[in-house]
Amino acid sequence: RKIPKVGHTFFQKPESCPPVPGGSMKLDIGIINENQRVSMSRNIESRSTSPWNYTVTWDPNRYPSEVVQAQCRNLGCINAQGKEDISMNSVPIQQETLVVRRKHQGCSVSFQLEKVLVTVGCTCVTPVIHHVQ
Amino acid sequence: RKIPKVGHTFFQKPESCPPVPGGSMKLDIGIINENQRVSMSRNIESRSTSPWNYTVTWDPNRYPSEVVQAQCRNLGCINAQGKEDISMNSVPIQQETLVVRRKHQGCSVSFQLEKVLVTVGCTCVTPVIHHVQ
């Protein structure tokens, strides 16, 4: 799903207030709901009719440092016999997410939000066009 | 997928530097890759064998203000005849994402990261347990 543009109004102070100095804002330390956890069914990536693999990207200057991307294993979907059925399509499900980018020069550290496109998994769909009968 | 705990080390300055004053950091205005867009297949939520609906939650003090949650429509999956097959299971695919929470008291505005659990879509899986024969 798409994150709308900021238009930078979200990060501005009310008009009646003095502007933010130096184009930066105050970000409080700590993360709300930090202990909240993903609780998905077990091994859905291999049990799905549109199975996928995970690839981990790592960047120490990004939070979270680890971003996991899914890649659909097949073009078609897996049928009840465990065979690929190319009359159906495996398609990725994508999500825009925010990460925090750390920028430092010596002891001067600042942070900036960054939009990242994550493929979260795959789903099996009826094709729009039947290339294959 | 799960966002690891910060351990707050990510937001700390190097040990040789003076600590961050008042438990806050500098967040630069603007978003990197703001124009990046999701490019998913059309209407996958209704074409999927595990179809889903979207619900939008809105909060003006959150960025993004709009967070979209998916809910699977069926317990089973939709077969080639368009009927629900309860020998297969529709399951949600979840993703932890970051949002920014705005907190203001008069002209004093600060921001804090918040972890949100988003259901991005659904996929069809072979069941672990057969509730129904």
Partner: nanobody, 123 residues
Framework: QVQLVESGGGLVQAGGSLNLSCVIS????????MGWFRQASGKEREFVAA????????VYADSVKGRFTMSRDNAKNTVYLQMNSLKPEDTAVYYC????????????????WGQGTQVTVSS
């Protein structure tokens, strides 16, 4: 914490009927299914029926198929279990719960249950 309140149980003769209801205080944004479960004395808790909030399709355990009917009222965040042709072996405490993964939900996925409602079927 989500609260679940089950009601409608009671003592009934074999062949009789009862209608259970369950109110869930807060549906999770992604929560899409509800289930009824039961636990007879000295036995493990077992699945009885499930329903999708959106699609409204229900599925049943073989032991209750054709006798029990599950329905839901989205506006009231309430699910029902109409139990007909009751048998002594239906005697148990009946619980409802959110099924976060639909039929893929296992008993291990739950960390909270309501108080349940006792159903006793005499012969």
């Amino acid at each position: 914490q989500v609260q679940l309140v089950e009601s409608g149980g009671g003592l009934v003769q074999a062949g009789g009927s009862l209608n259970l209801s369950c109110v869930i205080s807060r549906r999770t944004p992604s929560g899409y299914a509800m289930g009824w479960f039961r636990q007879a004395s000295g036995k493990e808790r077992e699945f009885v029926a499930a329903i999708s909030w959106i699609g409204g399709g229900a599925v049943y355990a073989d032991s209750v198929k054709g006798r029990f009917t599950m329905s839901r009222d989205n506006a009231k965040n309430t699910v029902y279990l109409q139990m007909n042709s009751l048998k002594p072996e239906d005697t148990a405490v009946y619980y409802c719960n959110d099924m976060p993964y639909g039929l893929d939900t296992t008993m291990d996925d739950y960390d909270y249950w309501g108080q349940g409602t006792q159903v006793t079927v005499s012969s």
